[in-house]
């Protein structure tokens, strides 16, 4: 394959593998629903190769197409809890810069307690990406029931 | 990087490409939690390339960051059977070797019938990846409900 | 970028980066459980490179292995209109050629209002998916709740 | 071909036991969960039970449950339901039936039936 | 649980005509997980369509299934005189598992 041997000793974040997965550090303090996020092989098998945290939030380094996903469970819920506490609403979004601000990802908690999508988006380096938890209830911090990452796909 | 050279005119598999989608086999004898996968091109749309089963569980052949996604349908459910029967809990991990053993993936089905998701983690040449589905209910075994997959997605 | 110049000048499509985000444009008349998708730059951050749609399905046209993936939200929903029209299910699946056809993926909104999944999957050029909603309930346009993709991820 | 005959069925009186079998042939019995139904007199077709081809995940219909277990001895290609504290309405023709590879709440192929009748 | 209500209970008919038989689910039933069965006196019952609408295993072409959501059909285009006999539906979609209560076809 020619794209095989055109791959000659270049490292690989300029092969366009830009990655991470992400842990929960906490919640934003009170009218912020934004979640904070953490990430790096001393905190367990959370990792950053390419984007960058910024104050907690996903900032991208390289254009391109990327797979956006996340799950979020919601810590202490039942199905009478979530739906009590309805509509609990997470959503994806780019929140800068401000001229590029847009959700995109967006699902309710009804009578579950975990939500968990992915999808294919374009963005750009420095786009920041935000999660937005609205409602009272608390995530879980586990760091296999609440996480958040992306994978560069194609330029 | 070695890996960039070693790349001129190598079969598919050394390119990293590893990738596997499986289906459900069947659930474990009493007091083993354990989902037993199955896959391979005579079975329909199931397939290994790289990954290997070793008794039904999935085995990573190279290192590297890899896409794990799983959908599991109960079979025997309905939205009372669900939280009736609470918590029935899908948890994926790493199970072998003990020294690596980890949950990476976890979700309850509440009030619903299917639980979906998928996350980045890192995993290594040998771990063997679990999926344990706690509680008496049966997981359905059509091929479009239920079915467990890695995708290797870079170093 | 350097990844750019060491491609020897191949367009991407030729490297296998076939990929496709697609947003809902509408549902399809009475007896026709269908979705009809639209993408494009011009509608926002839908995009279709190498796949392409007919008459509102997507069709392939590179052999591979694809992630595909889905979520579709109901538009007027509360966890008890879900259960009153319960259940309404999603199935996606290969619709043409019809000896190909098959069933890929299916989810039922039980006391939902949001189902999201995906999977890997081998698809051959001219396999046109179609996502059938059966039901009453009709799903939300909006960008950020329902979408549909897929991803080359392998020959 | 799918064979499978049920035996143990009789009279008990209310409150007693009775240990229903299923021999089965004809197919790979471990590869297939197994399911007993059940049809009082005059009645409509009721299930009753399921239990996965290794043996785990019994499930049961709430009019049984506590008072029925299903088992299975797959060296035996045998099938079982324990029936304990016997109820009047619990009179039936039992039916042990093969549950269809996919779905575990659909049976594909049925033995001719048990009568348990439950009287003093 | 679901209910399944299937009409009419006794359907006379004579040998080469069709039959059209209901089944009506008190909600949706999944996927159109239905199927029917065939049940002769004395006999267990005989796997006849799965899904709706698939014919089982060595079933004639004569019997055909349709219908999805809360009303379901078995037709019989031309009856033989082995086809009289019990017909139940049976939903598998949600657990538990139910069945109607027949719908006897006898000889006119």
């Known amino acids: 394959q020619r794209f095989a041997q055109a791959q000659q000793q270049l490292p690989l974040e300029s092969l366009g593998w830009d990655v991470a997965e992400l842990q929960l550090n906490h919640t934003g303090p009170q009218q912020d629903p934004r979640l904070y996020w953490q990430g790096g092989p001393a905190l367990g098998r959370s990792f950053l190769h390419g984007p960058e945290l910024d104050k907690g939030q996903l900032r991208i380094h390289r254009d391109g197409i990327y797979m956006v996903h996340i799950q979020v469970t919601l810590a202490i819920c039942s199905s009478t809890t979530a739906s009590r506490h309805h509509p609990t609403t997470l959503a994806v979004g780019i929140c800068s810069p401000a001229s590029r601000s847009i959700s995109l990802l967006r699902l309710s908690f009804h009578q579950g307690c975990t939500i968990a999508s992915q999808r294919l988006t374009p963005l750009a380096r420095g786009d920041t990406l935000c999660t937005n938890l609205t409602g009272t209830l608390l995530p879980s911090r586990n760091t296999d029931e609440t996480f958040f990452g992306v994978q560069w796909v194609r330029p | 990087q070695r890996f960039a050279q070693a790349q001129q005119q190598l079969p598919l598999e050394s390119l990293g490409w590893d990738v596997a989608e499986l289906q459900l086999n069947h659930t474990g004898p009493q007091q083993d939690p354990r989902l037993y996968w199955q896959g391979g091109p005579a079975l329909g749309r199931s397939f290994l390339h790289g990954p290997e089963l070793d008794k039904g569980q999935l085995r990573i052949h190279r290192d590297g960051i890899y896409m794990v996604h799983i959908q599991v349908t109960l079979a025997i459910c309905s939205s009372t059977t669900a939280s009736r029967h609470h918590p029935t809990t899908l948890a994926v991990g790493i199970c072998s070797p003990a020294s690596r053993s980890i949950s990476l993936l976890r979700l309850s089905f509440h009030q619903g019938c299917t639980i979906a998701s998928q996350r980045l983690t890192p995993l290594a040449r040998g771990d063997t990846l679990c999926t344990n589905l706690t509680g008496t209910l049966l997981p359905s075994r059509n091929t479009d409900e239920t079915f467990f997959g890695v995708q290797w997605v870079r170093p | 970028q350097r990844f750019a110049q060491a491609q020897q000048q191949l367009p991407l499509e030729s490297l296998g980066w076939d990929v496709a985000e697609l947003q809902l444009n509408h549902t399809g008349p009475q007896q026709d459980p269908r979705l009809y998708w639209q993408g494009g730059p011009a509608l926002g951050r839908s995009f279709l490179h190498g796949p392409e749609l007919d008459k509102g399905q997507l069709r392939i046209h590179r052999d591979g292995i694809y992630m595909v993936h889905i979520q579709v939200t109901l538009a007027i929903c509360s966890s008890t209109t879900a259960s009153r029209h319960h259940p309404t299910t999603l199935a996606v699946g290969i619709c043409s050629p019809a000896s190909r056809s098959i069933s890929l993926l299916r989810l039922s909104f039980h006391q939902g209002c949001t189902i999201a999944s995906q999977r890997l999957t081998p698809l051959a050029r001219g396999d046109t998916l179609c996502t059938n909603l059966t039901g009453t309930l009709l799903p939300s346009r909006n960008t950020d709740e329902t979408f549909f993709g897929v991803q080359w991820v392998r020959p | 071909e799918v064979q499978l005959l049920e035996s143990g069925g009789g009279l008990v009186q209310p409150g007693g036991s009775l240990r229903l079998s299923c021999a089965a042939s004809?197919?790979?019995?471990?590869?297939?969960?197994m399911s007993w139904v059940r049809q009082a007199p005059g009645k409509c077709l009721e299930w009753v039970s399921v239990i996965s081809g290794s043996g785990g995940r019994p499930n049961y219909a709430e009019s049984v449950k506590g008072r029925f277990t299903i088992s299975r001895d797959n060296s035996k290609n045998t099938l079982y339901l324990q029936m304990n504290s016997l109820r009047d309405e619990d009179t039936a023709v039992y039916y042990c039936?093969?549950?269809?590879?996919?779905?575990?709440?659909?049976?594909?192929?049925w033995g001719q039936g048990t009568l348990v009748t439950v009287s003093s | 649980e679901i209910v399944l209500t299937q009409s009419p209970g006794t359907l006379s008919l004579s040998p080469g005509e069709g039959a059209t038989l209901s089944c009506r689910a008190g909600?949706?039933?999944?996927?159109?997980?239905l199927g029917w069965y065939q049940q002769k006196p004395g006999q267990a019952p005989r796997l006849l369509i799965y899904g709706a609408s698939s014919r089982a295993t060595g079933i004639p072409d004569r019997f055909s299934g349709s219908g999805s959501g809360t009303d379901f059909t078995l037709t019989i285009s031309r009856l033989e005189p082995e086809d009289f006999a019990v017909y139940y539906c049976q939903q598998y979609g949600y657990s538990p598992p139910t069945f109607g209560c027949g719908t006897k076809l006898e000889i006119k």
């Open positions: 004809g197919f790979t019995f471990s590869s297939y969960a």
């Open positions: 909600q949706s039933v999944r996927s159109s997980y």
């Open positions: 039936a093969k549950v269809d590879y996919s779905n575990y709440l659909f049976f594909d192929y």
